[in-house]
Interface confidence: low
């Protein structure tokens, strides 16, 4: 399954929306910085598009879940959040269409299950951090910057897969 060209553009738009959501400078939040342990190797190890798509889907689904909470709605501009949801939703649709077309519908390899679990644990660490920091503006800014970084790394993987084919 070939992801449409619009999917790549949608990824760029998602990054740009995350950038627009910035409310305060990360420089003023240096004491709140945290290493969430993004499981980069889980993306780098998936050489088959069939293996990668479910992991990417999980990543985007978790971002959607994170930013669609009540606490998130209070933290960010409503209009930007709505645009952000729309972009994520479209990307989930693109990825789901690939799964329906037969990519990854065979038995799920254990390696892929492990990768999905690693992504879920990563987002659990982010959620726990936000709770511990009582959803402070700096905590949200640290998380916004982290999601930009991890989303960018995962979309770079998509691009490298596209160029390999």
């Amino acid at each position: 399954c070939d992801l449409p060209q619009t999917h790549s553009l949608g990824s760029r738009r998602t990054l740009m929306l995350l950038a627009q959501m910035r409310k305060i400078s990360l420089f003023s939040c240096l004491k709140d910085r945290h290493d969430f342990g993004f499981p980069q190797e889980e993306f780098g190890n998936q050489f088959q598009k069939a293996e990668t798509i479910p992991v990417l889907h999980e990543m985007i689904q978790q971002i959607f879940n994170l930013f669609s909470t009540k606490d998130s709605s209070a933290a960010w501009d409503e209009t930007l959040l709505d645009k952000f949801y729309t972009e994520l939703y479209q990307q989930l649709n693109d990825l789901e269409a690939c799964v329906i077309q037969g990519v990854g519908v065979t038995e799920t390899p254990l390696m892929k299950e492990d990768s999905i679990l690693a992504v879920r644990k990563y987002f659990q660490r982010i959620t726990l951090y936000l709770k511990e920091k009582k959803y402070s503006p700096c905590a949200w800014e640290v998380v916004r910057a982290e999601i930009m970084r991890s989303f960018s790394l995962s979309t770079n993987l998509q691009e490298s897969l596209r160029s390999k084919e």
Epitope: A19, R22, S25, F27, T79, A145
Partner: antibody, heavy 115, light 107 residues
Framework: MSQLVESGGGLVQPGGSLRLSCAAN???????MSWVRQAPGKGLEWVGS????????SIHRKFQGRFTISRDNSKNTLYLQMNSLRAEDTAVYYC?????????WGQGTLVTVSS | KTQMTQSPSSLSASVGDRVTITCDGT??????LAWYQQKPGKAPKLLIY???YHDFDVPSRFSGSGSGSDFTLTISSLQPEDFATYYC?????????FGQGTKVEIK
């Protein structure tokens, strides 16, 4: 994607005033906006910024008291009012969408201050 | 005020060359730095934001790196359309400031 078009530039005498406009082809209500200028053969210089609703304005220290920035979201237009103009204000003035970084720019309007 | 110092101020290179431009700030600015390309008579065009992210339609030969106060723009293989002036801009401290520019000329 928004497109920005500046207007209002031209030749003005030292001490004179000009009001520059920046019209957007779609909604800029949710974006901070900035003015950036560039003197002939020189680099880029930030002039000032305004928040989405216009409640917060920031002008570079060197222009305070002479330049004011405003916006009319109902007209999707940004303004730069320049008073007491000097020869060193001669430059191309750009408006831009400001996300911290500036991702959408107008084509610029030339302001020439000369007697 | 955060002063941004770009180097070199100009350079001559050939098509296919790898080109590196640096931007140093007087204060740390986390990753809040952008790179722009400007051609004569045209408005600047955003290339990279937040230190490393490409804007729409920016070729992958352009890459940004660095954080804190030292940043780099790299063009991996210079193309004829890349001859232009490049500016960095910090937005981590107020007021937002631009570097003085680096002119990339044909050797």
């Amino acid at each position: 994607m928004s497109q920005l078009v500046e207007s209002g530039g031209g030749l003005v005498q030292p001490g004179g005033s000009l009001r520059l406009s920046c019209a957007a082809n779609n909604d800029i209500e949710f974006n901070a906006m900035s003015w950036v200028r560039q003197a002939p053969g020189k680099g880029l210089e930030w002039v000032g910024s305004i928040s989405p609703k216009g409640g917060s304005k920031s002008i570079h220290r060197k222009f305070q008291g002479r330049f004011t920035i405003s916006r009319d979201n109902s007209k999707n237009t940004l303004y730069l009012q320049m008073n007491s103009l000097r020869a060193e204000d001669t430059a191309v003035y750009y408006c831009a969408r400001d996300l911290g970084f500036m991702d959408i720019w107008g084509q610029g309007t030339l302001v020439t201050v000369s007697s | 005020k955060t002063q941004m110092t770009q180097s070199p101020s100009s350079l001559s290179a050939s098509v296919g060359d790898r080109v590196t431009i640096t931007c140093d700030g007087t204060y740390g600015i986390s990753n809040e730095l952008a790179w722009y390309q400007q051609k004569p008579g045209k408005a600047p065009k955003l290339l990279i934001y937040d230190g490393e992210y490409h804007d729409f339609d920016v070729p992958s030969r352009f890459s940004g790196s660095g954080s804190g106060s030292d940043f780099t723009l790299t063009i991996s293989s210079l193309q004829p359309e890349d001859f232009a002036t490049y500016y960095c801009q910090q937005y981590g401290n107020w007021p937002h400031t631009f570097g003085q520019g680096t002119k990339v000329e044909i050797k």
